[in-house]
Structure formats: C-alpha cells, structure tokens
Interface confidence: medium
C-alpha cells in the first residue's frame, strides 16, 4: 500500500511543497515530540495479572535502531494468591509503529519505510472454549 | 543518530549515522498488517480489565486512523463478572511513530512524529497509600 | 436531552422487599452506567450499586445481600430490587448516569421517595 | 471504606462573599492510572443532586466559572468566587477511586 494521497478538496497541494522524484517521499528523521516521555502507572509489567518482561532488540540499520518487546510471563494469569490460574489466559497486546530501514545494495544505500509490530503489554482474557461435537 | 558498520570497500564510506532527510520509497513494507483491532481480536472483550476503542482519524498523518483504547471500568472484572475494586485496570501506553505531513497538506513530504498511544488495559494490583 | 426517572411504590412494610424502575430518555444503556443512591430524610448520600454498559455490576459490599440489579437496554430501563427492608431504609432513591465510567454522576433522577413502616 | 470529612458542615455567608470548603479523604484518591476520582456536587433545597466539578477540577457542563475545584492526594478545596443566591444549598465532596463510592457528609452554605 502506497501513502494515501490527500483527496480532501480543502487539501489543494500548496506552492511550496518540495519537489519529490516519482515513487518516493522526502522524509524529515528529526522526530517531532522526541522527548515525550511515557507516564505509564509504575511498573505495572510487574504488578499486572498477566505479568510481562522487556527485551530490547537492536538493529543497526534501522531507524529508531532500539525496539523494546514485551514478553508476557505466564500463559495463565496470576490470582489473588500470587498463583498461576491457567483457567485463564495472558495474551500479548499488539501495535504497529513505523521505522525507517536502510538497505545497502553494493554501495549505494536506499531507504525504505516498514511496518513493525511491537508487543507493549500483556492483559488476562477468558479463554475462547471450542467444543469437540 | 545511529552508527552503522562501515563498508571498508565502498567510497566516502563515513554514513554511520542516518541523515537527517532521507528519501523514502513510497510503498511500505509489511503493509498488510491489519491495523483495525476490533477485527484483528476480540481482546479488549475478554479481558478481565475490558477496554472500548476510539477512532482517531487525522488525514495529516500516516496511518491517518488510530485506534485509542479507553479501559471500561476503574476496577476489574472478577469471576463472577463484576466489577472488583481490589484490582486496577490501567492503560498499557505505546510510543509510536507516524508520519506528519510538512508542510501541512504536501502529498509526498513527512516528517516522523512520536504521539503516544493507549493500546489496551492490563488489570493490575493497587498501590495504595494510606493517611497516617 | 438527558433524563432519568425513578418509580417505586412510596410506603413498604417493615421485612418486605421493593422493586424500583429507572426509565431513562436522551442516551443509552448500551453506552453509560446507571447507579443507584439514597439519601434518608436531612441525611446524606449513600451509594448502592451500579450497573456498567456492558452489564456487569459494581454493589456496596455492605448492601450486597440485599440488592439485586438489572437492566433492559431495549426497553431503556434500570430495575433495583432492595430485599428485607427496616425502618432505617426510609429514603429517597435515586438513580443517575454515570459519566463514562469515571464513578461521576453527571445527571439525576428526581428521586423516589420510599417510607418503611408498619 | 474511604472516609470524606467536609468541613465545615455549615458555611454562613453573605451573596457576593467567597466561600471555600474543604474535603479531605482516609487514603490518597490517586488511581493506578493515574487519574483523581474526587468530584463535587451540589444539593438546592428540594431538589436532586447536581454534578459541579469532577476529577478534581474539572467543571461540569453549564457551571459558572465562579466555580473552581483543586488539590491532590488527600486534601481537596471547592471555592466559590461571588456566592449567588441559586449557590445556597449542600454541598457533596465524593470519591470513585475506591469502591465503594463514598460521599463527604455535607457542607450547608447558608445565608448569615
């Protein structure tokens, strides 16, 4: 999928947009809001039902080059006695974001957008129950 | 910026970093991942700290549609299906990265942009803090 | 716009039980809770149950035994059915939306006014 | 159960004086997500109750900016700028952090 072209008719491409080569985008890294920080109750990973651990993975051509995974512990949830209750189910819960990736091919470098879906957390579900007729 | 390996073969080989501007082929890779989770699962039903999900919708922005989850309740849902105060359900927060038109309205120009977002809701013990 | 209003009988006899109706215009029961609240006469508020959008419940654990609460999001109506009632429950009763599940009542009934005695 | 004490519990005044009460809880009204369920309501004589401020600080639809609410953690303060005649009434401090619900006891502002 390629990114939308605007098509709302207020959204007339102005004068001074940049001039751009066919089939490419020009693309700014300097991050708008890049020290925004997450104020995300205190360690919930470790104080959730369905705890989780982190894991950093690092990619030297790609753009943020650290993507943190959660991994959640458990495949039940933990109960009121700090006990594994596998009547119930940690799942991961997943979001995309969006990275820069850089390819060499010989000696000319190219760059290309990717999608990437990080696992933030996890939650404590009921398990879907499937009945052998 | 980020260090890369050099390419000891290749001239003018001194790119460790990503440049500040960069051209971007138009078509993403991994494109195909479903980005409405109302259709990819019915998590934030099951869970015992449910969740509703917003649509956020800004055409200045690649993906123009976020999905934003809000928890249901304060507490969370219990065996016997109510609501128990003695847990939390708290938002699990995600820093993404999206694409920002700029200038405003330019059909081929970005810049990246970092906005945080509510993924879904984790039920998790309280802290509590009692008056002395 | 949004209204709520309760219905109920006005004089219950000591040990007997009470059923309550909350018929509600101008939003959904399939979007907002509805709690219940009562107030005795020159007292103050003393919250009972709620009831979330999506059906499950949040009671007072000190009333728990003694309420049962239900809806009908067709109909637009909220049911409370109070068991075992003394004198100390004369009140007036309440019911009022929740303001999206954040426990703020944004708007009330006009109260039903309830006399336990024999 | 968390404990709301208002006080004071009546509050004589005079129309265009400010007022403030003050509503204080047993334990801190901070939520794991990071939000204050600690809201104000307003009782007119004969009448239902009426939401004024909630979490904290935030005024409800329809009220006048005479009205503000603010604090954190335990101690929290309803402050009326110039009383009006339709501000004559009792005044709720509740909590929604901790179940059950619990409401202060009530502050009557009264005329002198």
């Known amino acids: 999928r390629k990114i939308p072209k605007v098509g709302h008719t207020f959204f007339q491409k102005p004068e001074s947009c940049p001039p751009v080569p066919g089939g490419s985008m020009k693309l700014d890294i300097g991050i708008i809001n890049e020290n925004q920080r997450v104020s995300m109750s205190r360690n919930i990973e470790s104080r959730s039902t369905s705890p989780w651990n982190y894991t950093v993975t690092w990619d030297p051509n790609r753009y943020p080059s650290e993507v943190v995974q959660a991994q959640c512990r458990n495949l039940g949830c933990i109960n009121a006695q700090g006990k594994e209750d596998i009547s119930m189910n940690s799942v991961p819960i997943q979001q995309e974001t969006l990275v820069v990736r850089r390819k060499h091919q010989g000696c000319s470098v190219s760059f290309q957008l990717e999608k990437v879906l990080v696992t933030v957390g996890c939650t404590c579900v009921t398990p879907v129950i499937h009945h052998v007729q | 910026g980020i260090t890369i390996p050099r390419n000891p073969g290749c001239p003018n080989s001194e790119d460790k970093n990503f440049p500040r501007t960069v051209m971007v082929n138009l078509n993403i890779h991994n494109r195909n991942t479903n980005t409405n989770p109302k259709r990819s699962s019915d998590y934030y039903n099951r869970s015992t700290s449910p969740w509703n999900l917003h649509r956020n919708e800004d055409p200045e922005r690649y993906p123009s549609v976020i999905w934003e989850a809000k928890c249901r309740h304060l507490g969370c849902i219990n065996a016997d299906g109510n609501v128990d105060y003695h847990m939390n359900s708290v938002p699990i927060q995600q820093e993404i990265l999206v694409l920002r038109r700029e200038p405003p309205h330019c059909p081929n120009s970005f810049r990246l942009e970092k906005i945080l977002v509510s993924v879904g809701c984790t039920c998790v013990t309280p802290i509590v803090h009692h008056v002395a | 716009q949004v209204q709520l209003k309760e219905s109920g009988p006005a004089l219950v006899a000591p040990s007997q039980s009470l059923s309550f109706t909350c018929t509600i215009s101008g939003f959904s029961l399939s979007s907002y809770g509805v709690h219940w609240v009562r107030q005795p006469p020159g007292k103050g508020l003393e919250w009972l149950v709620v009831i979330w959008s999506d059906g499950t419940t949040t009671y007072n654990s000190a009333l728990k035994s003694r309420l049962s609460i239900s809806k009908d999001n067709s109909k637009s109506q909220v049911f409370l059915k109070m068991n075992s009632l003394q004198t100390d429950d004369t009140a007036m009763y309440y019911c009022a939306r929740d303001g999206y599940y954040i426990y703020t009542m944004d708007y009330w009934g006009q109260g039903t006014s309830v006399t336990v005695s024999s | 159960d968390v404990v709301m004490t208002q006080t004071p519990l009546s509050l004589p005044v005079s129309l265009g004086d400010q007022a403030s009460i003050s509503c204080r809880s047993s334990q801190s009204l901070v939520h794991s997500n990071g939000n204050t369920y600690l809201h104000w309501y307003l009782q007119r004589p004969g009448q239902s109750p009426k939401l004024l401020i909630y979490?904290?600080?935030n005024r409800f639809s329809g009220v006048p900016d005479r009205f503000s609410g603010s604090g954190s953690g335990t101690d929290f303060t309803l402050k009326i700028s110039r009383v009006e005649a339709e501000d004559l009434g009792l005044y709720f401090c509740s909590q929604g952090t901790h179940a059950p619900l619990t409401f202060g006891a009530g502050t009557k502002l009264e005329l002198n």
């Open positions: 979490k904290v600080s």
